[in-house]
């Protein structure tokens, strides 16, 4: 996420005793919370790798970029950033790697300028459906979020709730149609096995979608048709075996798209013929000559672009009487 940076000398660290003394009062204009570094010139506050267990209450009102990375926040309650006066300037919030396992409904309410949010590298076992929308209304007020970074938020298997992790994340993305203005969504490294079919249709403003390093086997039921602004689609490092005609046609129909497909176990049999034909013609796939067959073994390492229809056969299915167990 792009955020201004400043030299260390422009940051002021507060004296630790100040924080407890004034935490219940409105912050002084130039105050910096304990264990944080602040630069009013850069409108930036960094509370990084300090093992904080809660969001500091006395954040300066000028903050535009807030880094709360490498802490031990555990839970982000409703109104975690609600202040009087509100943090009206806060535009970029980075909470990555802060051991969050629960984000509650309305956690980001009262942040009218929040455009970039990074929750990556937190084991989010419980992400409220209303974490981003703030309310359970069927149509919420539009969120100002433009960029939502949710890479590696999958919790360890033994900590997952008894429900689909994909479903939990998608529910939060779609609640109240609050994220209609979202332009960048990163969902890399989350062990996603599938993409719920309705998710993309309801995020029409997306420019950049990163689904890399998941376990997606198929895109058969995923529609890209509505995503007319989509510029980059990252599908590297998944478990894709083939892309079928419907998907190929939809991708080809997107005017600005670049698709990244490296490191997928492509199965080069008769079902691959349409994709090979498409690859030879399309300009949308980046590094397309690096796509190689993984299966069957006789085809392993063959370059997809160099295949022709005669190479792509399917072993005949034997009638039951000839099959061996």
């Amino acid at each position: 996420s792009s955020s201004p940076t400043s030299s260390a000398s422009s940051f002021s660290s507060s004296a630790p005793f100040l924080a407890s003394a004034v935490s219940a009062q409105p912050p002084l204009p130039d105050q910096c919370p304990a264990l944080c570094e602040c630069s009013e010139a850069a409108r930036t506050v960094k509370c990084v790798n300090r093992n904080l267990t809660e969001v500091p209450t006395d954040l300066p009102a000028y903050v535009r970029n807030l880094f709360l990375t490498g802490n031990q926040l555990a839970v982000l309650p409703a109104g975690a950033f609600a202040r009087r006066p509100p943090l009206a300037e806060l535009a970029a919030l980075n909470l990555s790697g802060s051991r969050l396992d629960e984000v509650r409904a309305g956690a980001f309410e009262h942040l009218p300028s929040l455009r970039q949010l990074d929750l990556s590298h937190n084991p989010l076992a419980d992400l409220s459906p209303f974490a981003f929308s703030g309310s359970n209304a069927s149509v919420s007020a539009p969120s100002p979020l433009v960029e939502l970074i949710l890479n590696h938020i999958v919790p360890p298997e033994d900590e997952r709730q008894n429900r689909s992790f994909e479903g939990m994340v998608v529910a939060a993305l779609l609640a109240g149609r609050a994220l209609q203005g979202l332009r960048r969504l990163e969902l890399a490294s989350n062990h996603f096995l599938y993409l719920p079919r309705d998710v993309l249709a309801q995020l029409p403003s997306l420019r950049h979608l990163d689904l890399s390093n998941n376990s997606l086997v198929s895109l058969t039921y995923v529609s890209f048709r509505n995503l007319t602004h989509l510029e980059s689609l990252h599908l590297e490092d998944n478990a894709l075996k083939v892309l079928h005609n419907g998907t190929l046609a939809e991708l080809q129909g997107l005017p600005h798209i670049r698709v990244f497909l490296d490191n997928n176990p492509w199965v080069c049999d008769c079902h691959m013929a349409d994709m090979v034909t498409w690859l030879k013609e399309t300009e949308v796939v980046q590094g397309k000559d690096r796509l190689t067959c993984a299966y069957p073994e006789k085809m392993r390492n063959r370059v997809l672009l160099e295949l022709n229809s005669a190479d792509l056969d399917c072993d005949p299915i034997l009638p039951p009487s000839l099959q061996t167990s």
């Epitope: 490191n263 000559d289 690096r290 993984a294 392993r300 390492n301 063959r302 370059v303 160099e306 295949l307």
Partner: antibody
């Protein structure tokens, strides 16, 4: 069957360039990437980079950019690697292999010795 | 770059032994791991691809396993022709990288 036949050993002076060859037989040369690997005693195996012969596409290990240059001649089914501005650090055995998800078939290696 | 580490650089075993060679990656490599055998004459052969798939023509006494960052090659019944150096290699991210090798010798 698939074979990769590499050129013979080379004794070179520091500062010179050398061009190694790797002739492929037994498969469709343009259908697979060719990888180049360096082996120096005590340094294990290092991936230098790769070339897709039919298209001329290349990938280089950052460490070998400016040192190695790959080319291929599809009429003779031969891949080449040129090493420039040789130093004693370039003394090694160089292998070509057929890639890309694994290095399935290997040449016998070419020993390059750089000595004043 | 992804670092591949073979902690045992040499290993001595008797004929008929079961031998396990380990390899670890500096980050998760999603089972994108191969094993190679290099004979004393320099000849290199692919043994195992994608962590556990036996390359055609390789004896079934060779097997591979692992996940995440930790992988291993097992030779179940050591034969004289298995005397060689064994290398692991990741193909999860360019540049492809190798372990330092484990030299297997007969006791």
């Amino acid at each position: 069957q698939v074979q990769l036949q590499q050129s013979g050993a080379e004794l070179m002076k520091p500062g010179a360039s050398v061009k190694l060859s790797c002739k492929a037989t037994g498969y469709t040369f343009t259908g697979y990437w060719i990888e180049w690997i360096k082996q120096r005693p005590g340094h294990g195996l290092e991936w230098i980079g790769e070339i897709l012969p039919g298209r001329g596409s290349t990938d280089y290990n950052e460490k070998f950019k400016g040192k190695a240059t790959f080319t291929a001649d599809t009429s003779s089914n031969t891949a080449y690697m040129q090493l420039s501005s040789l130093t004693t650090e370039d003394s090694a055995i160089y292998y070509c292999t057929r890639g890309r998800l694994d290095f399935t078939y290997w040449g016998q290696g070419t020993l390059v010795t750089v000595s004043a | 770059d992804i670092q591949m580490t073979q902690t045992t650089s040499s290993l001595s075993a008797s004929l008929g032994d079961r031998v396990t060679i380990s390899c670890s990656a500096s980050q998760g490599i999603r089972n994108y791991l191969n094993w190679y055998q290099q004979k004393p004459d320099g000849t290199v052969k692919l043994l195992i691809y994608y962590t556990s798939s036996l390359h055609s023509g390789v004896p079934s006494r060779f097997s591979g396993s692992g996940s995440g960052t930790d992988y291993s090659l097992t030779i179940s019944n050591l034969e004289p022709e298995d005397i060689a150096t064994y290398y692991c290699q990741q193909y999860s991210k360019v540049p492809w990288t190798f372990g330092g090798g484990t030299k297997l010798e007969i006791k």
